[in-house]
Interface confidence: medium
């Protein structure tokens, strides 16, 4: 079955990187395009951006354009979020999901387990 | 970019009973080949969110036929028929027809 | 495996109507959109009519708006296209096609042919 | 409508050479969602079409990988790094970001 599994939380200092991954298996890893969503406390889900496992195609939240970057290791069907010049605000959940096509319509239909970024100095 | 309005926020219920959960868009979600990319999202207490419907009006696989979605344009509905006591959580809409895809705030579904 | 099969083409006057069936088999019909697309005489291809999986949703060309109507009955695994008021330039070969994966149509009938002629 | 224009009609190539088709779109296919929908199918002698590629440069299952696609906004192209005979048939691209979807007018691929 379709699985997402990501890396261990992780605690930063404001101004530092954080690096996500997400190993996907179940399906084929370079068919699907891989999002990646945060989740503030108490704050609504925010899409960060997407990339596209066979060609490394990104399309980003403006938002987060300039300190997201998404990548993908496709031997190892994983993806990556890397977010740099953290700022308390951005302690948050990371999710990673799975966005495919079926029968016309598209929808981000699998999701990972979330990693705790927490941003504290 | 396009704001998703849920409503309520908060949804008492009783087992047995019908749900009903609004979501607006402030843009048309249509596709200029006529789909409509509006997804609905349950996320458990402690848990990842997990995919009821898509498409407006599909029900992804798993789902129970208590879940169903409706709507058009920038007016979207998710009935639950019966409401189960393993039915509550937070309820989203998302959608992705424009970027950045925008989900609304959640609606919390909670037992009386 | 999949398996669309249309039937129902005739030779119909002008002004006049006809129902095409496509029967679907190897997959989960209910779970799929599905469309009309015709191949005219020089061998253009055109859309006629999609509908969503539920059949709540149907969409047309401005060319066939008005005149042709998509259904589908999901029990019967069958996808129909009713066409009235019919006209010399609707003469054409009309395959069913499953929406696939990515958008577009991934499975496609072997055609079943409509002539209109007086 | 958005008008679809292949070139060249015909293409005579030889077993085991290359072979290029172009697509232009009378305005770009880059959709609101970031995705665009330009797809490639074949229709051999006496057969319905076949899907080869979708989402520009997808192959479809079963679809051997001397076949690929490319191209962003408004031009397209489909690739044979080594015709087979068993390639030849008329080919036609596909667009779907806008409606009414629209198909080119084919290009013939016949064997030398």
């Known amino acids: 079955q379709v699985q997402l599994v990501q890396s261990g939380a992780e605690v930063k200092k404001p101004g530092a990187s954080v690096k996500v991954s997400c190993k996907g298996s179940g399906y084929t890893f370079t068919s699907y395009w891989m999002h990646w969503v945060r989740q503030a406390p108490g704050q609504r889900l925010e899409w960060i951006g997407e990339i596209d496992p066979s060609e490394s195609n990104t399309n980003y939240n403006q938002k987060f354009k300039g300190r997201v970057t998404l990548t993908v290791d496709i031997s190892a069907s994983t993806a990556y979020m890397e977010l740099s010049s953290l700022r308390s605000e951005d302690t948050a959940v990371y999710y990673c999901a799975r966005g495919g096509y079926d029968g016309w319509d598209y929808a981000i239909d699998y999701w990972g387990q979330g990693t705790l970024v927490t941003v504290s100095s | 970019d396009v704001v998703m309005t849920q409503s309520p926020l908060s949804l008492p219920v009783t087992p047995g009973e019908p749900a009903s959960i609004s979501c607006r868009s402030s843009q048309s979600l249509a596709k200029s080949y006529g789909n409509t990319y509006l997804s609905w999202y349950l996320q458990k207490p402690g848990q990842s969110p997990q995919l009821l419907i898509y498409g407006i009006s599909n029900r992804f696989s798993g789902v129970p036929d208590r879940f169903s979605g409706s709507g058009s344009g920038t007016d979207f509905t998710l009935k639950i028929s019966r409401v189960e006591a393993e039915d509550v959580g937070v309820y989203y809409c998302l959608q992705g027809t424009h970027q950045p895809y925008t989900f609304g705030q959640g609606t919390k579904v909670e037992i009386k | 495996e999949v398996q669309l099969v249309e039937s129902g083409g005739d030779l119909v006057k002008p002004g006049g109507s006809l129902k095409l069936s496509c029967a679907a088999s190897?997959?989960?019909?209910?779970?799929?959109?599905m469309s009309w697309v015709r191949q005219t005489p020089d061998k253009r291809l055109e859309w006629v009519a999609s509908i969503s999986s539920g059949g709540s949703y149907t969409h047309y060309p401005d060319s066939v708006k008005g005149r042709f109507t998509i259904s589908r009955d999901n029990a019967k695994n069958t996808l129909y296209l009713q066409m009235s008021s019919l006209k010399s330039e609707d003469t054409a070969m009309y395959y069913c096609?499953?929406?696939?994966?990515?958008?577009?149509?991934?499975?496609w009938g072997q055609g079943t042919t409509l002539t209109v002629s007086s | 409508d958005v008008v679809m224009t292949q070139t060249p009609l015909t293409l005579s190539v030889t077993i085991g050479q290359p072979a290029s088709i172009s697509c232009k779109s009378s305005q770009s296919l880059l959709d609101s969602d970031g995705k665009t929908y330009l797809n490639w199918l074949l229709q051999r002698p006496g057969q319905s079409p076949k899907r080869l590629i979708y989402l520009v440069s997808k192959l479809d299952s079963g679809v051997p990988d001397r076949f690929t696609g490319s191209g962003s906004g408004t031009d397209f192209t489909l690739k044979i790094s080594r015709v087979e005979a068993e390639d030849l048939g008329v080919y036609y691209c596909w667009q779907g970001t806008h409606f009414p979807q629209t198909f080119g007018g084919g290009t013939k691929l016949e064997i030398k």
């Open positions: 096609a499953r929406h696939g994966t990515g958008v577009g149509f991934d499975y």
């Open positions: 190897g997959f989960t019909f209910s779970s799929y959109g």
